[in-house]
């Protein structure tokens, strides 16, 4: 008789997810040579202690912070670009602007990446069937605490100017509701934060409207003055010339906006 | 078969400076990390300092940080150490070593020994 | 007082097997590699274990290393009068930015 099993309304786990992560880490120490000595091993061991026989409407914080003793990882803190809604354009800005990073591309960030992972209470086994969805089941589930584990210590070790990339195609440019706004927003240090840059990022070609004018921007606005952290915002109306100019900053049509 | 050779150790005066160099041969040596580990008279080993290959980063012991100065020329298969404001503790046998690709020290040169006192 | 802890001396006689623990932390040892090194005085350390538990060629199976948590260790089968030398466990200190040795620990070969 097969043994009952919780019926999540989210995906399971991604199929050959151990495998995943240490493939991922082990690709990621090749390519960062400055991370050569990490024991992928003992990353993946606490990676699963954080959520393996433990219910995946339950976890904490506190279950990942011995995973989260590896995220000392020195990345220069006033390189720092945060995202929302718009991954692929600020991931393919940091391939092209190398001393720049995403969360995306510290090794924690590299490993969980676009998986999704539960276990299941008092077993062992990884839940391959379906995850708890954050809306439909709950918040504390193992990838949604993860994210805002890690988005928090990212925005809490930022320094001088931040950069933030926004959709501005999205009809909340800024959404309270997203991981920028429910969490780096908060855990930017205005001791160490001096402004935060927005870059709104068209969707249009004939878009000529100041995105910045927008009244979600304004609150993000709101937000960081009250905490004491400069604002600035730009547009970027065509983000193919923008990334174009990344790459080949001499070329002669680079200095007129973008 | 690879080669670390040391020099420019000495006997020097508290808050004097010395230079250490090391000449490699026999791998491609702007492949490498680099590192330099001493051993003090009776004591054990102690990592001193670290180069990265391509646009060098540098890494160090809080002991010697803002004295000491590890540098490499990739042109000359040469790592240096450019040690100011000695201390009587810094006096050690230092050894070149190159980092293998887990972050080992694979290979080791002979030492050269660094005395201060006055 | 080194940040990596190891016995000061371990003995044996020939043809025994002695083991050397080393014990660190999560910043340490628990997340990256430990290296084993073999030093003789008046001659260069030699490496002897990588990656925990990985010898490099011309190593003597003999040597073996391990890895649990935030400690390791080296055993020495079948204990010869050539090892007798000092030994050290290393790792990388996420902490301190840089390696960190043991203390180092003496093995004696007996009769």
């Known amino acids: 008789v097969p043994r009952w099993r919780q019926q999540w309304s989210g995906p399971g786990t991604t199929k050959r997810f151990p495998e995943t992560v240490l493939a991922r880490c082990v690709k990621y120490t090749e390519i960062h040579p400055e991370m050569r000595h990490v024991d992928c091993q003992s990353v993946w061991d606490a990676f699963k202690g954080a959520f393996i026989s433990k219910h995946p409407c339950n976890i904490t914080e506190e279950d990942y912070q011995p995973l989260m003793k590896l995220g000392t990882q020195t990345v220069p803190c006033n390189k720092i670009l945060l995202w929302s809604r718009i991954k692929d354009l600020a991931h393919q800005f940091t391939q092209v602007q190398r001393d720049m990073f995403t969360l995306e591309d510290t090794l924690l960030g590299y490993l969980a990446d676009d998986l999704t992972w539960c276990g299941e209470f008092n077993t062992s086994k990884i839940n391959y069937q379906s995850c708890p969805d954050w809306r439909k089941d709950c918040s504390n589930n193992p990838v949604s605490v993860f994210w805002k584990t890690v988005s928090r210590r990212f925005a809490e070790a930022a320094c001088d100017v931040v950069h933030v990339m926004l959709n501005g195609s999205r009809s909340k440019i800024f959404d309270k509701n997203s991981t920028f706004g429910s969490v780096e927003v908060h855990n930017l240090q205005p001791e160490k934060v001096q402004t935060l840059e927005a870059w709104v990022i068209h969707g249009g070609r004939e878009d000529s409207r100041d995105l910045c004018q927008d009244p979600t921007i304004k609150e993000l606005e709101s937000i960081i003055s009250k905490r004491n952290i400069q604002f600035s915002c730009k547009n970027i109306y065509r983000p193919d010339k923008f990334l174009q100019c990344v790459k080949n900053p001499e070329d002669s049509s680079c200095t007129s906006e973008i | 078969q690879v080669q670390l050779v040391e020099s420019g150790g000495g006997l020097v005066k508290p808050g004097g400076s010395l230079r250490l160099s090391c000449a490699a041969s026999?791998?491609?040596?702007?492949?490498?990390?680099m590192s330099w580990i001493r051993q003090a008279p009776g004591k054990g080993l102690e990592w001193v300092a670290s180069?990265?290959?391509?646009?060098?980063?540098?890494y160090y012991a809080d002991s010697v940080r803002g004295r000491f100065t590890i540098s490499r020329d990739n042109a000359k298969n040469s790592l240096y150490l450019q040690m100011n404001s000695l201390r009587a503790e810094d006096t050690a046998v230092y050894y070149c070593?190159?980092?293998?690709?887990?972050?080992?020290?694979?290979?080791w040169g002979q030492g050269t020994l660094v005395t201060v006192s006055s | 007082q080194s940040v990596l802890t190891q016995p000061p001396s371990a003995s044996g006689t020939s043809g025994q097997r002695v083991t050397i623990s080393c014990s660190g932390s999560?910043?340490?040892?628990?997340?990256?590699?430990v290296y084993w090194y073999q030093h003789l005085p008046g001659t260069a350390p030699k490496l002897l274990i990588y990656?925990?538990?990985q010898r490099p060629s011309g190593v003597p199976d003999r040597f073996s290393g391990s890895k649990s948590g935030n400690s390791a260790s080296l055993a020495i089968s079948g204990l010869r009068s050539e090892d007798e030398a000092d030994y050290y466990c290393?790792?990388?200190?996420?902490?301190?930015?840089?390696?960190?040795f043991g203390s180092g620990t003496k093995v004696t070969v007996l009769g």
């Open positions: 990656k925990n538990n």
């Open positions: 026999g791998f491609t040596f702007s492949d490498d990390y």
């Open positions: 070593a190159r980092e293998g690709w887990s972050g080992e020290f694979t290979d």
């Open positions: 999560s910043s340490n040892i628990g997340f990256h590699f």
């Open positions: 180069v990265s290959n391509g646009r060098p980063t540098t």
């Open positions: 290393a790792a990388w200190d996420d902490s301190l930015s840089g390696y960190v």
